[in-house]
């Protein structure tokens, strides 16, 4: 029950996070005109990853797309790439996790397969969240650098007579949306990975089987790939997951990939 709840909650948190990453990527307010300590202008500038906008106090807003690709700063291109990778990974992760949900039955899908899918989606969510956080952080760093550069020469005088006010930009709403969304996706991914640990079957679905060979009596003992002797094929036996709690005599058992989250 706790596993289902953890998995479900992880899915929901990741879903919200990815929706937030998409929203942040599409938002125009990645950087907004700094109004502090500036002359009060009747024009407000703000910029996104895809276009820049100007809102006049008249209420008229005009947005212009960045129609050039080569003319854009490399950092902006990098941020775009990180956000898109984050969205793509997150979307695939969501798709995978839907089929991995314990509460959804698809054919005769085994719990081990669901565990695999849960882990896969969890890792995808973690990477997606990290991509978003990285993208937003790179953009924020770019803003901070530009802010202090423009503050250093905020007023560029022409013979001391005419002044040009340099527009400074500060953090826009999209950055905070991106950070929070990336964090949620990351948390959701971790929850999916945790849920994966408890997803595989805890007991075998078969009875103990006796094998008879000449001169040897081999009994298969349930408990995780262990036979009383060192030979014999285990291809007929299902792998079982023992949740990582091993006794001293179980040190020879093969580690499942789910043991390492």
């Amino acid at each position: 029950m706790a596993v289902t709840a953890c998995q479900g909650l992880g899915f929901v948190v990741s879903l919200i996070g990815i929706a937030g990453i998409i929203a942040a990527t599409c938002m125009d307010q990645w950087s907004t005109q700094d109004l502090y300590n500036n002359p009060v202008t009747a024009v407000f500038n703000y910029q996104g990853l895809w276009r820049s906008c100007v809102r006049e106090s008249s209420g008229f807003t005009e947005c212009r797309g960045y129609f050039t690709l080569l003319g854009l700063p490399a950092m902006l291109q990098a941020v775009r790439a990180l956000m898109i990778v984050g969205i793509v990974l997150g979307a695939i992760g969501l798709l995978v996790s839907i089929f991995a949900l314990k509460c959804i039955r698809i054919g005769s899908m085994e719990d081990s397969a669901k565990a695999n899918m849960t882990l896969t989606s969890g890792i995808m969510f973690i990477v997606s969240g990290l991509c978003a956080i990285a993208g937003v952080s790179v953009f924020a760093n770019m803003l901070v650098t530009n802010f202090w550069m423009s503050t250093a020469n905020m007023y560029t005088g022409m013979g001391g007579m005419v002044q040009t006010v340099q527009t400074r930009y500060t953090f826009g709403a999209a950055l905070f949306v991106g950070w929070v969304a990336g964090g949620l996706t990351l948390i959701g991914g971790v929850m999916m990975c945790i849920a994966c640990r408890g997803l595989a079957p805890e007991e075998t679905n078969y009875k103990a089987v006796s094998y008879h060979a000449s001169g040897h009596s081999v009994a298969y003992k349930p408990g995780g790939f262990k036979a009383s002797t060192g030979f014999g094929s285990n291809t007929k036996n299902k792998k079982i997951y023992d949740g990582g709690a091993r006794t001293e005599d179980e040190v020879q058992s093969y580690p499942s990939k789910h043991d390492y989250v």
Partner: antibody, heavy 118, light 113 residues
Framework: EVQLVESGGGLVKPGGSLRLSCAAS????????VSWVRQAPGKRLEWVAT????????YYLDSVRGRFTISRDNAKNSLYLQMNSLRAEDTAVYYC???????????WGQGTSVTVSS | DIVMTQSPSSLSVSPGERVTMSCKSS????????????LTWYQQKPGQPPKLLIY???TRESGVPDRFSGSGSGTDFTLTINSFQAEDVAVYYC?????????FGAGTKLELK
């Protein structure tokens, strides 16, 4: 047809109060920023105050800040200018205007005259 | 506050003549965000409210005759009347629409010669 009609002007003593009104029609008032501009006899135009649409941010000329209050009633398509502590230098024709692209004032009322004199 | 300086203060013009008047601002009215200059030109005839002619320094308001044109960028702006007509007798004001307070120039008075 866009129309802006001012009212409420008149003669008032220094230190007195007056409330100017502007009835707007022919456009979506609630979506427009509107301003008051005044012109003293034989003088240049002087912007007084602006109130934006939506959040209704207000901006004032330094010499009237604290004495004048611009407000709007979108339900009534009306703009107001409450003028307190009036001075002789506030004597002017007060125009109600609509802000347009480029923050330009594209429509003007005929104006209402305010005289501050003892 | 932004100071708007207009010149000349008055001008006597004959019909058909080309008229140019200047407006200078104490700070640049160019917005880096959209590369537009927030300067507006108005025409005021005696006993009437002002009429919008040009906004964004060079965009003509609809209904304004094409003999009126605006140019300039940053701090220096010009209003040109290509072929002056008798009905163009008025005072022409430029206005800073970028910084609050929105300030007007003292005006250029055009008279018929």
């Amino acid at each position: 047809e866009v129309q802006l009609v001012e009212s409420g002007g008149g003669l008032v003593k220094p230190g007195g109060s007056l409330r100017l009104s502007c009835a707007a029609s022919g456009f979506t008032f609630s979506n427009s920023a509107v301003s008051w501009v005044r012109q003293a006899p034989g003088k240049r135009l002087e912007w007084v105050a602006t109130i934006t649409s939506g959040v209704s941010y207000t901006y004032y000329l330094d010499s009237v800040r604290g004495r004048f209050t611009i407000s709007r009633d979108n339900a009534k398509n009306s703009l107001y200018l409450q003028m307190n502590s009036l001075r002789a230098e506030d004597t002017a024709v007060y125009y109600c205007t609509r802000q347009f692209k480029g923050n330009a004032l594209d429509y003007w009322g005929q104006g209402t005259s305010v005289t501050v004199s003892s | 506050d932004i100071v708007m300086t207009q010149s000349p203060s008055s001008l006597s013009v004959s019909p058909g003549e080309r008229v140019t008047m200047s407006c200078k601002s104490s700070q640049s009215l160019l917005n880096s965000g959209n590369q537009k200059n927030y300067l507006t030109w108005y025409q005021q005839k005696p006993g009437q409210p002002p009429k919008l002619l040009i906004y964004w320094a060079s965009t003509r308001e609809s209904g304004v005759p094409d003999r009126f044109s605006g140019s300039g960028s940053g701090t220096d702006f010009t209003l040109t009347i290509n072929s002056f007509q008798a009905e163009d007798v008025a005072v022409y004001y430029c206005q800073n629409d970028y910084f609050y307070p929105l300030t007007f120039g003292a005006g250029t008075k055009l008279e018929l010669k």
